[in-house]
Interface confidence: low
Amino acid sequence: HNTTVFQGVAGQSLQVSCPYDSMKHWGRRKAWCRQLGEKGPCQRVVSTHNLWLLSFLRRWNGSTAITDDTLGGTLTITLRNLQPHDAGLYQCQSLHGSEADTLRKVLVEVLADPLDHRDAGDLWFPGESESFEDAHVEHSISRSLLEGEIPFPPTS
């Protein structure tokens, strides 16, 4: 499996999509896990509804949500309020019994928010500071939004 990179902005919601063959994975629940080390285990973060027919219902574990379009063959994971510690290697999985097939390997990278400017016209980026903790990061997004979610701050 090649690794697909998804770059999200700190404080925003990042949506990760994992396409799959809907017939091949018919009836299978899905999961999102975080790879622990290059050859380590993949630690489960969140999985779809226990009843496969209800896989379209969004399930949350903390700030991570999962939903599955079983007809279209697309698993969608949402990482809300993305933080630097969310960066890393993940997998989308298709579950069958105690086994899991990897649908996609995903590398999540966290960028700074260009609209979080401390000085007018001055952008702050990862290269300018030791860590994200130096800056105030407001909610912002460049992705599809969740229903009812208002991730952007009002303009001042």
């Epitope: 998804f6 960028l111 260009p114 290269g127 460049s142 939004l145 701050p153 303009t155």
Partner: antibody, heavy 120, light 108 residues
Framework: QVQLVQSGAEVKKPGASVKVSCKAS????????IHWVRQAPGQGLEWMGI????????SYAQKFQGRVTMTRDTSTSTVYMELSSLRSEDTAVYYC?????????????WGQGTMVTVSS | EIVLTQSPGTLSLSPGERATLSCRAS???????LAWYQQKPGQAPRLLIY???SRATGIPDRFSGSGSGTDFTLTISRLEPEDFAVYYC?????????FGGGTKVEIK
């Protein structure tokens, strides 16, 4: 399909202002950043700034600070870029561009470009 | 401001040949923050690569990106007739986002 359609070519005198529009369609307008990039004839690409169509907040390249204003109209899914105090070196094709899902600071959907000529 | 220098300025090759384009940054750019574009005359640029090595949607696998630090490379494994164009690199680690001056890939 997803597309950005820009306004037509403009000819302006030095010292004047120009306002270029960029109408988005085929996607949720408020969910993606829009950038502006320009290209002088026979030259390379130059990033001008970024606007968040949801809140309207902006950030501009220092070079254009004080001369450029980016705004949006959510009712028509249109972004505007106004450049004032025009000089001959502002003659260029001006592009609006949307960021893709995978990375918010690169540009995968571009407008067709608007040629702005500054000449006395 | 990060300055990106592309070389060579012009690359003369035949269809089927391998093209190697270079982009050098004036200061270190994390590999996560470099992109490549293709531009044909009279057209807007087209995103090829982001994150130094991730192909954008719909980009053929003959295009690949690599590199880190200050040196980055775009490789076209086997040139097709439609690949003859100008190629730009772009950094987005620091404001302002900047582009290289471009490399023109022309038919030999």
């Amino acid at each position: 399909q997803v597309q950005l359609v820009q306004s037509g070519a403009e000819v302006k005198k030095p010292g004047a202002s120009v306002k270029v529009s960029c109408k988005a369609s085929g996607y949720t307008f408020t969910s993606y950043y829009i950038h502006w990039v320009r290209q002088a004839p026979g030259q390379g690409l130059e990033w001008m700034g970024i606007i968040n169509p949801s809140g309207g907040s902006t950030s501009y390249a220092q070079k254009f600070q004080g001369r450029v204003t980016m705004t949006r109209d959510t009712s028509t899914s249109t972004v505007y870029m106004e450049l004032s105090s025009l000089r001959s070196e502002d003659t260029a094709v001006y592009y609006c561009a949307r960021a893709p899902q995978e990375s918010p600071y690169v540009f995968d959907i571009w407008g067709q470009g608007t040629m702005v000529t500054v000449s006395s | 401001e990060i300055v990106l220098t592309q070389s060579p300025g012009t690359l003369s090759l035949s269809p089927g040949e391998r093209a190697t384009l270079s982009c050098r940054a004036s200061q270190s750019v994390s590999s996560s923050y470099l992109a490549w574009y293709q531009q044909k005359p009279g057209q807007a640029p087209r995103l090829l690569i982001y994150g130094a090595s991730s192909r954008a949607t719909g980009i053929p696998d003959r295009f690949s990106g690599s590199g880190s630090g200050t040196d980055f490379t775009l490789t076209i494994s086997r040139l097709e007739p439609e690949d003859f164009a100008v190629y730009y690199c772009q950094q987005y680690v620091n404001s302002p986002f900047t582009f290289g001056g471009g490399t023109k890939v022309e038919i030999k």
